[in-house]
């Protein structure tokens, strides 16, 4: 009879056994192993019990103790299990970022192991377990779905296996995976509301602004804000689930048309864009031309007045004929034309809104000098003694200088108050001089006595 | 559909003048800002000169400046590039292109016309 | 500086992604836009904006930036994308309206 101990081995991948091989016959012709396993004998005296060492044992097997004895042969089998943990504990790639309601695949390969049997693959989130399968096929895979909810937000999810060899007097062995870290966000299916001018004047600032709400984690949100090629960069302020992005807008002559105005924002892998036109345009105030800005009395004046070549202008409230950007009037200057305002309103429609601009420009009349009997009578009669005020005002452009006098000597105080006396009395001669001549004009002062009775 | 046609390339002696047409159709000509690219036979492209839509501002590379003028005609749909005092280093295929603003990026482009400066 | 740098030569495996890049100040402030020219003809847009391609323009071609650089990324490139590729920027140093970079010739392979 042979026999064989341990009759039962659990040892690691690359392991070493000691196996006796025993006969109960006191002297076999033949006491041995077969395995295809490297094996060393130890020597020991007697010759019915041989001990071998196994060494370098990479997978189960059952070596087989022979002996030949008188009464016959016979064997007996030991049998090996080699343990090993898994190679490879591996969860599929995600991309880090996933949407809130969405069904996330975990999946979970493990690459080698032994024993199968006692072999554990728990999918985790935290230390809470979702899913715990016997690892089966190489490489085994565990799968489980998971509702992304908002407080999965930072979770991190793994797979560990087991190893459980505590049955067979050894201990528990686990392997871990690499962590998944989960970020979850809420990006609205609604675009962002973009508030700006719709028109916006070459050389001007104007403010744009760009609002979400509805987004988790807000702090996570990336806005991105341009016109046209130019990046611009807005002060971002977040409340609890929303945004707004303020930025100002400088535009010069090279923005000049139509441009695209984009706020774009992007949450975890989607974006949500909004787009907006916006019309930069340039529209310089009208001119007001005078053939001269001062001209003589009776001289024929010429007003012009030029716009945008799209606008349209009135000049004094007169439309261009035809309507255009250019309107123009004749007159013939009279002083009453002195001071007189000629006002040019131009109008030029930018993307369906009327934008007005005005100009006006003063025509200075050189006339006179006038002295006539409304504004310098010719004759006065004052009591004597009594207050008067002389009044003689002389009409021009440029203002003439008045002087009457008396003989060329005797001046008559024109504007001041005066105690009427006989000397006052008499015919003066008014002469009003400017740089556009002289008038010369008659007033005689008469004084009446009081009467003695 | 847009489309950009230049004319008035060829053969000019150096020191002449040359004037460029750019025959637009397909876009309203007026709402758009035109420009002049360049680029000599086997080298990269070259900006030479803008106008904006309405034709109030006029923009050009230092190496034309004061040489070329740019202007339009848009009750004619057309772009203008009058080049005087030739050089040269002014030999290249002539490109006009659109631009839904004076500083943007080019949205169509003509076939282009051969100017030639001969010493 | 108003200068716009791009590698002269590039080279791509058919189907396979290439990158093409042009660095430049002027960057930080505006966006790129992109231009294939194939030899003898006229170039054509292929991206503008932060990446927005016109009508037409494969999605294949996309485009992004950061700092002062900005990228021209064909993905599964194919024969027909074999030509000249310049990017375009709005001038920031104020001495041109808008300028080029030199170019980059794109081969694909295979």
């Known amino acids: 009879q042979t026999s064989v101990s341990p009759s039962k081995v659990i040892l690691p991948r690359g392991g070493s056994v000691l196996v006796t091989c025993s006969t109960s016959c006191d002297q076999p012709k033949l006491l041995g192993i077969e395995t295809p396993l490297p094996k060393k004998e130890l020597l020991l005296p007697g010759n019915n019990r041989k001990v071998y060492e196994l060494s370098n044992v990479q997978e189960d097997s059952q070596p087989m103790c022979y002996s030949n004895c008188p009464d016959g042969q016979s064997t007996a089998k030991t049998f090996l299990t080699v343990y090993w943990t898994p190679e490879r504990v591996e969860l599929a790639p995600l991309p880090s970022w996933q949407p809130v309601g969405k069904n996330l695949t975990l999946r979970c390969q493990v690459e080698g192991g032994a024993p199968r049997a006692n072999l554990t693959v728990v999918l985790l989130r935290g230390e809470k377990e979702l899913k715990r399968e016997p690892a089966v096929g190489e490489p085994a895979e565990v799968t489980t779905t998971v509702l992304v909810r908002r407080d999965h937000h930072g979770a991190n999810f793994s797979c560990r296996t087991e190893l459980d060899l505590r049955p067979q007097g050894l201990e528990l062995f686990e392997n871990t995976s690499a962590p998944y870290q989960l970020q979850t966000f809420v990006l609205p299916a609604t675009p962002p509301q973009l508030v700006s001018p719709r028109v916006l004047e070459v050389d001007t600032q104007g403010t744009v602004v760009c609002s979400l709400d509805g987004l988790f984690p807000v702090s996570e949100a990336q806005v991105h804000l341009a016109l046209g090629d130019q990046r611009l960069n807005p002060t971002v302020t977040y409340g609890n689930d929303s945004f707004s992005a303020k930025a100002s807008v400088s535009v010069t002559a090279e923005d000049e048309g139509t441009q695209r105005l984009t706020c774009a924002v992007i949450l975890g892998n989607q974006s949500q864009e909004t787009l907006q036109t916006v019309t930069i345009y340039s529209f310089p105030a009208p001119n007001v031309i005078l053939t001269k800005p001062e001209v003589s009395e009776g001289t024929e004046v010429t007003v012009k007045c030029e716009a945008h070549p799209r606008a349209k202008v009135t000049l004094n409230g007169v439309p261009a004929q035809p309507l255009g950007p250019r309107a123009q009037l004749l007159l013939k200057a009279t002083p009453e034309d002195n001071g007189r305002s000629f006002s040019c309103s131009a109008t030029l429609e930018v993307a369906g809104q009327l934008i007005h601009k005005n100009q006006t420009r003063e025509l200075r009349v050189l006339y006179g000098p006038r002295l006539d009997e409304r504004d310098c009578p010719g004759n006065w009669t004052w009591p004597e003694n009594s207050q008067q005020t002389p009044m003689c005002q002389a009409w021009g452009n440029p203002l003439p200088e008045l002087k009457c006098l008396k003989d060329g000597t005797f001046p008559l105080p024109i504007g001041e108050s005066v105690t009427v006396t006989r000397d006052l009395e008499g015919t003066y001669l008014c002469r009003a001089r400017s740089t556009q001549g002289e008038v010369t004009r008659k007033v005689t002062v008469n004084v009446l006595s009081p009467r003695y009775e | 559909q847009v489309q950009l046609q230049e004319s008035g390339g060829g053969l000019v002696q150096l020191g002449g003048s040359l004037r460029l047409s750019c025959a637009a159709s397909g876009f309203t000509f007026s709402s758009y800002a035109m420009s002049w690219v360049r680029q000599a036979p086997g080298k990269g492209l070259e900006w030479v000169s803008a106008i904006s839509g309405s034709g109030g501002s006029t923009y050009y590379a230092d190496s034309v400046k004061g040489r070329f003028t740019i202007s339009r005609d848009n009750s004619k749909n057309t772009l203008y590039l009058q080049m005087s005092s030739l050089r040269a280093e002014d030999t290249a295929f002539y490109y006009c292109?659109?631009?839904?603003?004076?500083?943007?990026?080019?949205?169509?482009w003509g076939h282009g016309t051969l100017v030639t400066v001969s010493s | 500086s108003s200068e716009l740098t791009q590698d002269p030569a590039v080279s791509v495996a058919l189907g396979q992604t290439v990158k093409i890049t042009c660095q430049g100040d002027s960057l930080r402030t505006y966006y790129a836009s992109w231009y294939q020219q194939r030899p003898g003809q006229a170039p054509v847009l292929v991206i503008y904006g932060e990446n927005s391609r016109p009508s037409g323009i494969p999605d294949r071609f996309s485009g992004s930036s950061s700092g002062n650089t900005a990228s021209l990324t064909i993905t599964g490139a194919q024969a027909e994308d074999e030509a000249d590729y310049y990017c375009?920027?709005?001038?920031?140093?104020?001495?041109?309206?808008?300028?080029f970079g030199g170019g980059t010739k794109l081969t694909v392979l295979g």
């Open positions: 375009n920027s709005r001038d920031s140093s104020g001495n041109h309206l808008r300028v």
């Open positions: 292109a659109n631009s839904a603003y004076t500083g943007g990026w080019y949205d169509y």
